[in-house]
Interface confidence: low
């Protein structure tokens, strides 16, 4: 016989989730096992299976597991079949769904003080208890005129009245959990004694001295009333007219009409509804005063053939925003085609040279048009009207190298010299047309040259070579007047440069010819011991063949040069005392001597009482103050040379005498006492 | 939050001139019309005008029209008033007022000595 | 311009006190009339706009009536901090103008 140990047995189940119903049998033979459920045979599925005899539910249904359930155990050999008790689950649930109305039968039935009622669909088991929101607030029993039953998913409102306008919602809990409405209910029930919105104010933009107006009206019953207030205060009624607002009219309807409008009737206007009951109703229109400004000026556009270019209109500033075209030859632009308008934008596709020219953007609105014009030139490459010339250039003299070009827009021309570019300074000079000037040409200038010719749309270049020919000049050019040293050897040289190297003599300007001990060697005139008669004016002739000769006169002067006879020695002098230094000087000319104090030189016109310079030179100071102290230097100097010798002055405070001096004592340092 | 704040107490001489300045925070600036209004020590409270600083319009009480010049800064939202041809009786704390009067500014004293 | 005239100039009462402060305008001027309250030494501070409008932050033992020409402003149990002088002033019509004002002082 087939015995059951363990049989299934009802139990409480949680939608959703685990369960077990057990089955274990004990046969002599070979039994198999399956279930029934409400006399069906059940399949095993992912959700419900068997497991050994017990049959396993990974989550209940409460559809598909409500019923019966049975555990058959059968001997397939003997055919003998045994059945265990039924078994059922108990499942507790809970599903959201929608707040409805359940009366009257439609929304537009819904009318004030009339009964309203409201369904909840939340369902469950066991069934739940109901809770009710209006605008999220819990309602309570009683509460407000309406009665609710929390046990019931009913809520009834009677009368309904504009009080209960809100958003209905509800929620509801049981065993199983809690859960609240899917979808919410808008009640809204209109007080006719509330201002309701029939037209609203709309935002205009007027152009100044136009008119402007707007249309506002309310309905309530009793009817609303209706007020206008300007900016954020003051009220326009045609009895009281703010004084900027004096052209302004209110009609019956609720209308506001403003005429000639000036920039100070802009801005918000508002319209103030007010029922008998209720909020007042508030609507805002602005009045904006039509603008426009000016547009940005446009740089003018170079563009190379072939290319595609844009160019953007900026639209002006504007109220209301302008509407922007593009005209060329006073034609308006097409959207499309090779040269046309894409938005704001100016698009010239594959430029030719025949688009070169005035294009035009346009901004217009009420309050005017603006327009601004952009030229347009289609860049070509140069061509050559004159290139450079391989040149030969004097020294001296200014030269010029040709670089004449022509394109749109005009070339731009830059020169090389050497590979270096040419910066223009005090020697060079590009003029317009692209010629290169070189003032005073010098030797070093014989290089290449190259110039750069250019447009956006390419480049041209060519070069020359400039040969410089060299003037006949002296090199250095001699002193114009030269001291020798009377009794002492003496050269003068003089040396010159040409396009051929030239010869160069010595002859005294009188045409005398020179003294034996004066030799002329190579352009350097030798004095071997000199006399006073060597003293004169002399004359350099340098010359060659192509270039002729030229000439430099030199006054040579015989001198004895300065020594000193006496110089200043270091001197120490007490304070309020005269301070001595002795200078004198010899050679001729006779030299004349200078002082130097303090590194300044002391202009004997300038000295003041205190100071005095002797005709033998020397320089007394006065009342000698410690800002006297310093470096003084005898300066000796004639038309032929300068010497200068230098000494330090001390200025001490005299010291107070002690008790084993008398009064002879010497000082301890060498004085000047006067 | 929304606040005005005025300048600094002024001590001026018989026949100059002042600026007061009041400077708006917390609020769109342009949405709201500034009121100026004088309290003489230990009296009421007298209107001098309004400016719309959106527009830059004014409006003056008649016994102030020679006496105060109302100008505003947008983009600083600052709100001016110049007294000119001072005398004596200009002595008083002035305030400046949002629309509504909802809102006051801190008041400046202005004080007219030889 | 519109005359605003208000009574009495002052006022003593009592704390827990109700209290009454008058405002006549010498022309209609609809709704449009606000309450102020000045404290010693302080800026002026509204109370009430329109009329009744509570402004804000105002306790509610102050409350406004009236309309057209004649107004009140009513203080239900005075509490110290109600010290002040009170003004009222119209919008109806510039140039905007106040009450002389009316000082409350505690018994």
């Known amino acids: 016989a087939i015995v059951f140990i363990k049989q299934p047995s009802s139990q409480d189940a949680l939608q959703g989730r685990r369960a077990l119903l057990r089955c274990e049998v004990e046969a002599p033979g070979l039994v198999h096992v399956y279930w029934l459920l409400d006399g069906a045979p059940v399949q095993d599925t992912e959700r419900r299976f068997t497991q050994g005899s017990s049959l396993s539910f990974a989550a209940v249904d409460r559809l598909q597991d409500s019923g019966t359930f049975q555990c058959v155990a059968r001997d397939d050999v003997t055919g003998e079949e045994a059945r265990s008790a039924n078994a059922s689950f108990n499942i507790k649930w809970i599903e959201a769904g929608p707040v409805v109305l359940k009366h009257p039968a439609s929304e537009a039935e819904i009318q004030p003080q009339t009964q309203v009622t409201l369904r909840c669909h939340i369902d469950g088991h066991p069934r739940p208890t109901y809770q009710w929101f209006r605008d999220g607030t819990p309602l309570s029993d009683g509460q407000s005129n309406n009665t609710v039953s929390s046990k019931e998913r009913n809520l009834t409102l009677r009368p309904a009245g504009p009080e209960h306008s809100g958003l209905y919602s509800c929620c509801a809990h049981n065993a199983f959990g809690q859960a609240c409405s899917s979808q919410n209910f808008t009640l809204s029930i209109a007080d006719e004694s509330f201002a309701r919105v029939v037209l609203a104010p709309q935002d205009v933009i007027v152009a100044r001295n136009e008119e402007a107006m707007f249309h506002c009206q309310f309905s309530a019953q009793p009817p609303p009333n209706l007020q206008w207030l300007f900016e954020d205060e003051t009220p326009i009624t045609n009895r009281s007219r703010p004084p900027h607002l004096r052209r302004a009219t209110v009609f019956a309807n609720g209308s506001l009409l403003l005429t000639q409008v000036r920039p100070r009737n802009a801005g918000v206007y508002r319209c103030i509804g007010q029922g008998q009951r209720g909020p007042p109703v508030i609507l805002e229109a602005t009045l904006h005063l039509a603008e426009i400004e000016d547009m940005p000026l446009f740089e003018p556009r170079v563009f190379t053939a072939g290319s595609e270019e844009r160019v953007t209109c900026l639209p002006p500033k504007g109220l209301p925003e302008p509407s922007v075209w593009w005209e060329h030859a006073g034609v308006r632009l097409p959207t499309h085609g090779r040269v046309y308008q894409k938005g704001h934008e100016l698009v010239l596709a594959s430029i030719a040279e025949s688009d070169a020219g005035v294009y035009t953007c346009h901004a217009a609105n009420l309050a005017g048009q603006r327009r601004q014009d952009v030229n347009i030139t289609v860049a070509t490459v140069p061509t050559w009207l004159k290139k450079p010339q391989d040149s030969q250039l004097e020294e001296g003299k200014p030269g010029y190298l040709h670089c004449l070009t022509q394109a749109t827009p005009k070339p731009t021309v830059v020169w090389y010299r050497n590979q270096m570019l040419i910066s223009e300074d005090s020697r060079f000079e590009v003029f317009k047309n692209g010629t290169l000037r070189i003032n005073n040409v010098e030797v070093y200038d014989g290089t290449w040259y190259r110039c750069v010719s250019s447009t956006p749309a390419g480049s041209i270049e060519a070069q020359a070579r400039v040969q410089v020919l060299e003037k006949l000049k002296f090199t250095p050019p001699p002193q114009p007047q030269q001291c020798m040293e009377f009794d002492k050897e003496a050269t003068v040289p003089c040396s010159a440069t040409g396009r051929e190297k030239p010869t160069i003599k010595w002859e005294r300007a009188d045409g005398s010819s020179l003294p034996e001990w004066v030799t002329d060697n190579a352009g350097t005139l030798h004095f071997a011991r000199v006399t006073r008669d060597d003293a004169g004016n002399y004359t350099c002739i340098a010359s060659n063949g192509p270039q002729g000769q030229i000439r430099a006169h030199v006054q040579l002067t015989v001198a004895v040069f300065i020594t000193f006879k006496v110089e200043p020695e270091r001197t120490t002098v007490y304070q309020g005392h005269t301070a001595l230094l002795q200078c004198e000087a010899q050679g001729d000319p006779k030299p004349l001597i200078q002082w130097k104090g303090k590194d300044r030189i002391l202009d004997p016109t300038k000295l003041g009482p205190r100071m005095h310079i002797f005709q033998n030179g020397s320089l007394v100071i006065h009342d000698v103050a410690p800002e006297d102290s310093g470096r003084y230097t005898c300066i000796a100097g004639n038309s032929c040379n300068i010497k200068h010798t230098e000494a330090p002055l001390y200025v001490v405070d005299k010291p107070v005498p002690e008790e084993s001096e008398g009064p002879g004592s010497p000082p301890p340092y060498k004085m000047i006492q006067t | 939050q929304v606040q005005l704040q005025q300048s600094g107490a002024e001590l001026a001489k018989p026949g100059a001139s002042v600026r007061l300045s009041c400077k708006a925070s917390g609020y769109t600036f342009t949405r709201y019309w500034m009121h100026w209004l004088k309290q003489r020590p230990g009296q009421g409270l007298e209107w001098i005008g309004y400016i719309n600083p959106s527009s830059g319009y004014t409006e003056y009480n008649q016994n102030f029209k020679d006496k105060a010049t109302l100008t505003a800064d947008k983009s600083s939202s600052t709100a001016y008033m110049q007294l000119s041809s001072l005398t004596y009786e200009d002595s008083a704390v002035y305030y400046c007022?949002?629309?509504?009067?909802?809102?006051w500014g801190t008041g400046t004293t202005v004080t007219v000595s030889s | 311009d519109i005359v605003m005239t208000q009574s009495p100039s002052s006022l003593s009462a009592s704390l827990g006190d109700t209290i009454t402060i008058t405002c006549h305008a010498s022309q209609n001027i609809n709704l449009w009339l606000s309450w102020y309250q000045q404290k010693p030494g302080n800026i002026p501070k509204l109370l009430i706009s329109?009329?009744?409008n509570l402004h804000t932050g105002v306790p509610s033992r102050f409350s406004g009536s009236g309309s057209g020409s004649g107004f009140t402003l009513t203080i239900s149990s005075l509490q110290p901090e109600d010290i002040a002088t009170y003004y009222c002033?119209?919008?109806?019509?510039?140039?905007?103008?106040f009450g002389s004002g009316t000082k409350l002082e505690i018994k």
């Open positions: 002033q119209q919008g109806q019509s510039y140039p905007f103008t």
């Open positions: 329109k009329a009744s």
């Open positions: 007022a949002r629309s509504y009067f909802d809102v």
